[in-house]
């Protein structure tokens, strides 16, 4: 297993609709054709794998398990979007990238993106 650098933004604020997007960029040492990306959430004394996708370079990312994630890839960048977030989902979201094929296997883990989610205030009753 060889180490690889992964970069991601330090902080992202989710939209009022509970959607947060960020870029996960990895320094690929070679020409990987199969890449696995996993997003982990670290908060509340546990680590949760939020979503994971394995993709062939140039193809769409496919997530399993009723995923709350969507994503696209472009070169060594993965554009990730997490939806359906609520205030309680605020936490550190870590991007993990694995170059699966061809060998050798490379693993990179980012420092994490702190995603802040603020639940929208309910609209006041209106006479109109």
């Amino acid at each position: 297993c060889k180490a690889m650098h992964v970069a991601q933004p330090a902080v992202v604020l989710a939209s009022s609709r509970g959607i947060a997007s960020f870029v996960c960029e990895y320094a690929s040492p070679g020409k990987a054709t199969e890449v696995r990306v996993t997003v982990l959430r670290q908060a509340d004394s546990q680590v949760t794998e939020v979503c994971a996708a394995t993709y062939m370079m140039g193809n769409e990312l496919t997530f399993l398990d009723d995923s709350i994630c969507t994503g696209t890839s472009s070169g060594n960048q993965v554009n990730l979007t997490i939806q359906g977030l609520r205030a309680m989902d605020t936490g550190l979201y870590i991007c993990k990238v694995e170059l699966m094929y061809p060998p050798p296997y490379y693993l990179g883990i980012g420092n994490g993106t702190q995603i802040y989610v603020i639940d929208p205030e309910p609209c006041p009753d209106s006479d109109f």
């Epitope: 546990q46 949760t48 939020v50 979503c51 994971a52 399993l64 398990d65 009723d66 995923s67 709350i68």
Partner: nanobody, 126 residues
Framework: EVQLVESGGGLVKAGDSLRLSCSAS????????MGWFRQAPGKEREFVAS????????SSADSVRGRFTISRDNAKNTVYLQMNSLKPEDTALYYC???????????????????WGQGTQVTVSS
């Protein structure tokens, strides 16, 4: 309704290993995330680990990470908890539970789970 039956508990020494199993019958097992929780005497039920419907995603409590591994076999309708390097503080009644979804960010909360087993006792002596 899903029936969940845990097994594999017992009395072991600190540092030993145990493998818990949870067999499910009833509704389609492969559509839902599964979780393990535990409850020590006089304490609240706490999250241990969970696994997504397909088995590709997991979540675990800090207190067990690196020691406990959750896995599942959808062909056998069974979820497992491999417990290594057990400590006296792991002593508890261990429950298996079925999540109402395939996966979510709230898999560590008890309210996400609809069906629960009766539990299997794990006792770790020093």
């Amino acid at each position: 309704e899903v029936q969940l039956v845990e097994s594999g508990g017992g009395l072991v020494k600190a540092g030993d290993s145990l493998r818990l199993s949870c067999s499910a019958s009833g509704r389609t097992f492969a559509n839902n995330a599964m979780g393990w929780f535990r409850q020590a005497p006089g304490k609240e039920r706490e999250f241990v680990a969970s696994i997504s419907a397909s088995g590709t995603l997991t979540s675990s409590a800090d207190s067990v990470r690196g020691r406990f591994t959750i896995s599942r076999d959808n062909a056998k309708n069974t979820v497992y908890l491999q417990m290594n390097s057990l400590k006296p503080e792991d002593t508890a009644l261990y429950y298996c539970a079925r999540n109402r979804r395939a996966w979510s960010l709230s898999v560590h909360t008890t309210r996400e789970y609809d069906d629960w087993g009766q539990g299997t006792q794990v006792t770790v002596s020093s």
